[in-house]
């Protein structure tokens, strides 16, 4: 797995470099997670033909994966920093159960899946420090998450491959939208 942001050899070799600002650290963290997702998507696409055939084979997606909407205030039109930040943190917290599901779904990229999961936890902590209105952030119910995990794992191999593909695609889109929004803050 790649080395997490701030721990690469260049950082060690350049002690004179200005420490990263909070925004730069968040930006770097998201880009690091996106790199990890790319690697996981590569394995998923190589292993099955989900990436090409998923659209026509998918009748219904009840995963309720977090998605940015106009009302969340993260788009350029109607941008609202506080509302958007709450949405990003809430969305990442909701993605955690799906990232847990991804563990053990990869053979050659097992470490990468773990790195994506752990880096997301760190990202949530960074963002929570940035957020003022923490009261507005709802944490997913652990019992509901446990039940969801059981349902996902009950699916057969083919559906689990499809689910993995959908999670990675949605998480990538969510992070890309978050990155664009955070750069406006």
């Amino acid at each position: 797995a790649p080395v997490p942001p701030g721990e690469d050899s260049k950082d060690v070799a350049a002690p004179h470099r200005q420490p990263l600002t909070s925004s730069e650290r968040i930006d770097k963290q998201i880009r690091y997670i996106l790199d990890g997702i790319s690697a996981l998507r590569k394995e998923t696409c190589n292993k099955s033909n989900m990436c090409e055939s998923s659209k026509e084979a998918l009748a219904e997606n009840n995963l309720n994966l977090p998605k940015m909407a106009e009302k969340d205030g993260c788009f350029q039109s109607g941008f609202n920093e506080e509302t958007c930040l709450v949405k990003i943190i809430t969305g990442l917290l909701e993605f955690e159960v799906y990232l847990e599901y991804l563990q053990n779904r990869f053979e050659s990229s097992e470490e990468q899946a773990r790195a994506v999961q752990m880096s997301t936890k760190v990202l949530i902590q960074f963002l929570q420090k940035k957020a003022k209105n923490l009261d507005a952030i709802t944490t997913p119910d652990p019992t509901t998450n446990a039940s969801l995990l059981t349902k996902l794992q009950a699916q057969n191999q083919w559906l689990q491959d499809m689910t993995t593909h959908l999670i990675l695609r949605s998480f990538k889109e969510f992070l890309q939208s978050s990155l664009r929004a955070l750069r406006q803050m």
């Epitope: 969801l148 057969n156 083919w158 559906l159």
Partner: nanobody
């Protein structure tokens, strides 16, 4: 172990109607997505319709939309396929299928875990 048993097939005239039934035993239906597939001689098995019990949502192949209706009786653990305005090209063996989980519902046959033996539907012109 889940067992699916289809019934209701037969020989009908073009334009007629027919209702297929699929009775399941071994587990309650609520945890499944249920589907109907068909296979004509020399052709691949194709998706016809699907239903999710928990949400009551239905899906159809374009070729049967507006003519076929999938429904279910939760209490009796039975799923139905009401086929109206039948055409000769609807002739096939019809299979009932069940998929665990229902979080992702698919039109692809590998998504389904359990299959019935099939019931023959023949539509003559």
């Amino acid at each position: 172990q889940v067992q699916l048993v289809e019934s209701g097939g037969g020989l009908v005239q073009a334009g007629d109607s027919l209702t297929l039934s699929c009775a399941a035993s071994g587990r309650p239906f609520s945890s499944f997505a249920m589907g109907w597939f068909r296979q004509a001689p020399g052709k691949e098995r194709e998706f016809v319709a699907a239903i999710t019990w928990s949400r009551g949502t239905t899906h159809y192949a374009d070729s049967v939309k507006g003519r076929f209706t999938i429904s279910g009786d939760n209490a009796k653990n039975t799923v139905f396929l009401q086929m109206n305005s039948l055409k000769p090209e609807d002739t096939a063996v019809y299979y009932c299928a069940a998929a665990d989980g229902w979080k992702v519902v698919s039109t692809a046959s590998p998504a389904y875990d359990y299959w019935g033996q099939g019931t023959q539907v023949t539509v003559s012109s």
